[in-house]
Amino acid sequence: PEPPTACREKQYLINSQCCSLCQPGQKLVSDCTEFTETECLPCGESEFLDTWNRETHCHQHKYCDPNLGLRVQQKGTSETDTICTCEEGWHCTSEACESCVLHRSCSPGFGVKQIATGVSDTICEPCPVGFFSNVSSAFEKCHPWTSCETKDLVVQQAGTNKTDVVCGPQDRLRA
């Protein structure tokens, strides 16, 4: 029979014949022959391979270095890499999450639109008219100005994006 030019799924072509790939968690030791099956070996501890493969070396698990603000989100196995995330109050600097930076705070006049997560930074927005923020915070939203009317008071000092309005008593009309 003619040698194959393509192989089935989970196989690879070598020396004009189709050999079985090694399953996730195992590496290739020797290709199959006419008389023998592909020889695979399990990855060592703290190593992995996450696909059907013909790799001769397993990949090392990622190290979630606490000195870089990292912690383990998902422990590595023979078939999966370790997944790192950041300690509370920090977020990853890249998709690979190789290091962390402190969450950004929103300055006075700005409020938090979206609170940071382990993988994304704080998103700030300017406080619109009628709202203010007088603190630098990674959690505080813009607060609405106090409604003097509902307290039977009048505005004595207008609010800004950084300060609340100041309410005061209504001037009594003299008889």
Partner: antibody
Framework: EVQLVESGGGLVKPGGSRRLSCAAS????????MHWVRQAPGKGLEWVAY????????YYADTVKGRFTISRDNAKNSLYLQMNSLRAEDTAVYYC????????????WGQGTLVTVSS | DIVMTQSPDSLAVSLGEKVTINCKSS????????????LTWHQQKPGQPPKLLIY???TRESGVPDRFSGSGSGTDFTLTISSLQAEDVAVYYC?????????FGGGTKVEIK
């Protein structure tokens, strides 16, 4: 036969130091990750620290971070736990346990060594 | 940290009776890459170190009798002893093997009635 034998336990004063050892035999020590787990008298199990087979990866419980150091010597088939600034709450039986690269679970445990921190 | 909550704390069962121990984790123990739940059960007999009983939620360690079985997924897990034997008197611990820090349940003490 897999064997893990801990030693180095004893009575220590608060603020003092102690070094525990775990001698491994019956398997290729350098192929396995290792853990220290402790158990306070009459209480449950608490994980303390982990070191990977090749020394590259080390993790600690927050309760011991900065005070305890896990290390290993693959040539001597030995695991160590250096414990500094000991506190009364560190009083426990300390077990070493093996982690393989297949189950990723602690599949063998030593008999444990008791560390008592008291003045 | 993942909190592991076991129930009951203890139970006394007659020989030959069924034992059910529950374990709840504060977050999922499902590894997204290989779809295995990294929940481990250990058995600790009086005066002895713990011994691995079940890993990946339901896979019995070699040499463990088939009266022991594990089930569950995500955050809810169960250890069952189908017919209690005298040698099963022990404390049973579930353990998060999904992430660091590794965490254990408080333990369930199984005694004979």
């Amino acid at each position: 036969e897999v064997q893990l034998v801990e030693s180095g336990g004893g009575l220590v004063k608060p603020g003092g130091s102690r070094r525990l050892s775990c001698a491994a035999s019956g398997f290729t020590f350098s192929d396995y990750g290792m853990h220290w787990v402790r158990q306070a008298p009459g209480k449950g199990l608490e994980w303390v620290a982990y070191i990977s087979s090749g020394n590259r990866i080390i993790y600690y419980a927050d309760t011991v971070k900065g005070r305890f150091t896990i290390s290993r010597d693959n040539a001597k088939n030995s695991l160590y736990l250096q414990m500094n600034s000991l506190r009364a709450e560190d009083t426990a039986v300390y077990y070493c346990a093996r982690q393989d690269g297949y189950r990723y679970a602690m599949d063998y445990w030593g008999q444990g060594t008791l560390v008592t921190v008291s003045s | 940290d993942i909190v592991m909550t076991q129930s009951p704390d203890s139970l006394a069962v007659s020989l030959g009776e069924k034992v059910t121990i529950n374990c709840k984790s504060s977050q999922s123990l499902l590894n997204s890459g290989n779809q295995k739940n990294y929940l481990t059960w250990h058995q600790q007999k009086p005066g002895q170190p713990p011994k691995l009983l079940i890993y990946w939620t339901s896979t019995r360690e070699s040499g463990v009798p088939d009266r022991f079985s594990g089930s569950g997924s995500g955050t809810d897990f169960t250890l069952t002893i189908s017919s209690l034997q005298a040698e099963d008197v022990a404390v049973y611990y579930c353990q998060n093997d999904y992430t660091y820090p590794l965490t254990f349940g408080g333990g369930t003490k199984v005694e004979i009635k």
